[in-house]
Amino acid sequence: AVDLTLLANLRLTDPQRFFLTCVSGEAGAGRGSDAWGPPLLLEKDDRIVRTPPGPPLRLARNGSHQVTLRGFSKPSDLVGVFSCVGGAGARRTRVIYVHNSPGAHLLPDKVTHTVNKGDTAVLSARVHKEKQTDVIWKSNGSYFYTLDWHEAQDGRFLLQLPNVQPPSSGIYSATYLEASPLGSAFFRLIVRGCGAGRWGPGCTKECPGCLHGGVCHDHDGECVCPPGFTGTRCEQACREGRFGQSCQEQCPGISGCRGLTFCLPDPYGCSCGSGWRGSQCQEACAPGHFGADCRLQCQCQNGGTCDRFSGCVCPSGWHGVHCEKSDRIPQILNMASELEFNLETMPRINCAAAGNPFPVRGSIELRKPDGTVLLSTKAIVEPEKTTAEFEVPRLVLADSGFWECRVSTSGGQDSRRFKVNVKVPPVPLAAPRLLTKQSRQLVVSPLVSFSGDGPISTVRLHYRPQDSTMDWSTIVVDPSENVTLMNLRPKTGYSVRVQLSRPGEGGEGAWGPPTLMTTDCPEPLLQPWLEGWHVEGTDRLRVSWSLPLVPGPLVGDGFLLRLWDGTRGQERRENVSSPQARTALLTGLTPGTHYQLDVQLYHCTLLGPASPPAHVLLPPSGPPAPRHLHAQALSDSEIQLTWKHPEALPGPISKYVVEVQVAGGAGDPLWIDVDRPEETSTIIRGLNASTRYLFRMRASIQGLGDWSNTVEESTLGNGLQAEGPVQESRAAEEGLDQ
């Protein structure tokens, strides 16, 4: 069972001093987000017993394995059901405490009732403040039964539940009709899933015979020991004031466990600590009684004395629960109450015994749960004891359960049962997860879900190149940390598998499923530099770069050009997908913008070092287009152009540029400057006769503007072939701007 205890402080004179504490003795309990242990939860459960809302209760965590609930302001805050939840996974367990108001009309004679399947349970509510009206019994908040007030027997209302079954478990209450629910007597009924002394599916297995009021768990056959007792069968008493499965916890305060109610996992329920009794656990046991709720009687023989915490204290020469066994009777010594082995191991189990006559090898035997008897293979004889060693055949899961070491001599016999837990080594159900990769390393999360039993003591990561027959490389890692596999080959697939181990010999599980993880390409190492750049328009930039010469093939797939517009906080990226390219035209840029420019080589997804940056200023965009361009032939070699100035000019025009092209011709156009910006007409001379020409023009301020519409016009016929078109007021060699 899970080592979980819910303590209620029952010193009820002041509700504000009342507290509930949940203590877990489980390894790693309460660490919260830790994958190996969910947190302890402690809360009031208002589903069945609803109380008026009050200020919220305060929850305080004390270390990783303890949580305390305080902040009760009035007695009614205390009434009802509280629960603590602890343990991980399939071991998650809820411990329940039911609190009754000491001033209620009806009080339970006993709050927790643990009964076996098929038993008759009797709940008894004692009249504390009489009302001459019906008593309503409820089960888990729903109507269950009615008693007339005349039906009280010796001042008690009894509810008989014959032939109880596990679904009958729950919270029962007895309430007078018309009375406040807070005046009810609240009970908790726990019905074990099996008949007395049985456990397991089908209730076929025999309980170990729990001592000192321990209760056999119907699922796993373990004894849930009362507070203050320990051992597989609760055979050992803790020191006064201690509790927990290994007596590892100490009761708070100077008066030890006085005034504390202890609630343990079902099917135990709640009781006072060892040595105490009464509704508030403040009364010491009467002489001759001991244990939780003082339910046990000593009946010591042979001069033994009764200790209210531990039972009979035997004089020299006697032992046994009632000091009924002479020390001459053989006795099993120091047998561990619980042993754990891994599946398919062949452990050695030792069993020591003393007595008179002295036990010999053949007088000590080991009995497995299936009844098989093992004889010892060797014995070590010492003056005060004989230790028999048993070689156990390969363990199977069915070997889990209660084993027994038995010694028999002519002086009598003794036996000691102990629990053997056969654990299944853990096997990963999934492959490890790749977190990040580089060219020579992989970062892997090895923590995966697994079948079998924890805790995980070590994690081994096995890896080797895919399709390789070489030996696996192995790295041993901490279960909760990510692993970096180093010194790998770039651009290589690796098969990676996890192997988990649990403590103990043979705790290594089978390897988990493989997964393929591929290292990245090698990083490109060459740093380009920018050779130059020039503006090809207000929004176009041609860039060229170089790489250092190195021997061997170039490691790279292409280049990445980056333009950073600091004013707008925008980055433009241009991918050049050939590693041989050394120039690129960047278009669609923003005129008048200051850019920072660099280039870097890339390989796969990895970027090499960036070139030293260059700073480039694109000219601002030019003025709008001239309007209403018109062409008129004047002669066989002259055409006059007329236009209107552009509208909404951002500044004074410095010149116009006219583009002249023969219609349908394949040659490049000619550009002619008109340097007098105030003009709205010009004559283009030196044209060929009978030839159709296309004209368009644009203005320039700091940069060239937009082109106007294109116009067509033909020169007149019969002229001589001209040398080429010129503008009226300039010589041709001055005006041409190819």
Partner: antibody
Framework: EVQLLESGGGLVQPGGSLRLSCAAS????????MNWVRQAPGKGLEWVSV????????YYADSVKGRFTISRDNSKNTLYLQMNSLRAEDTAMYYC???????????????WGQGTLVTVSS | QSALTQPASVSGSPGQSITISCTGT?????????VSWYQQHPGKAPKLMIS???NRPSGVSNRFSGSKSGNTASLTISGLQAEDEADYYC???????????FGTGTKVTVL
């Protein structure tokens, strides 16, 4: 589904006896208080008697006290009303009714049978 | 224990609201919140309509509502419908040895 079925009614002479039965099904009969309620022809409802789940407590209307006896057999899920020294004014439809409880635990008659007619006449 | 007092009859037109009163003593209606109301159509068994003064069981129309003031409990039927025509009885838990007492009954007629 909760069902209550009365039987045993009929014509009886004044001073005679009759035993009514009520067979219950669809609920845990042994956990509930059970009642007999009667209604004379053209008149209102009159509560007659109640018996507690264990059978350990019974109560009667003044008009029938000493003449009628309510009982139950929890093993047979059956409620009974033994009527002795019958009078003409006992002529009525006799209903058996279960006491149920609301969320605030008030007792009321939540399920009724269809009734059995008792006629006391010479 | 005498019966609780109810009006012999109450009538109303469809869609109207009507209220039936039920007057008792401090030993019954006034002493407990345990008043219930039953509807009975001719030739049929009574049916629980209201419990605990104002608690409507599932399946009962929300046109039926109950209340209590002092020694008098009331049943209100709003939006009266033809199928509401029936006899209505109140009942109370009582402190006397009779435990339960019914009202004299009210015949509701839908005009």
């Amino acid at each position: 589904e909760v069902q209550l079925l009365e039987s045993g009614g009929g014509l009886v002479q004044p001073g005679g006896s009759l035993r009514l039965s009520c067979a219950a099904s669809g609920f845990t009969f042994s956990n509930y208080k059970m009642n007999w309620v009667r209604q004379a022809p053209g008149k209102g409802l009159e509560w007659v008697s109640v018996i507690y789940p264990s059978g350990g407590a019974t109560y009667y209307a003044d008009s029938v006290k000493g003449r009628f006896t309510i009982s139950r057999d929890n093993s047979k899920n059956t409620l009974y009303l033994q009527m002795n020294s019958l009078r003409a004014e006992d002529t009525a439809m006799y209903y058996c009714a279960r006491v149920g409880y609301s969320s605030s635990w008030d007792p009321h008659f939540d399920y009724w049978g269809q009734g059995t007619l008792v006629t006391v006449s010479s | 224990q005498s019966a609780l007092t109810q009006p012999a009859s109450v009538s109303g037109s469809p869609g109207q609201s009507i209220t039936i009163s039920c007057t008792g003593t401090s030993s019954d209606v006034g002493g407990y919140n345990y008043v219930s109301w039953y509807q009975q159509h001719p030739g049929k068994a009574p049916k629980l309509m209201i419990s605990d003064v104002s608690n409507r069981p599932s399946g009962v129309s929300n046109r039926f509502s109950g209340s209590k003031s002092g020694n008098t409990a009331s049943l209100t039927i709003s939006g009266l419908q033809a199928e509401d025509e029936a006899d209505y009885y109140c009942s109370s838990y009582t402190s006397s040895s009779t435990l339960y007492v019914f009202g004299t009954g009210t015949k509701v007629t839908v005009l």
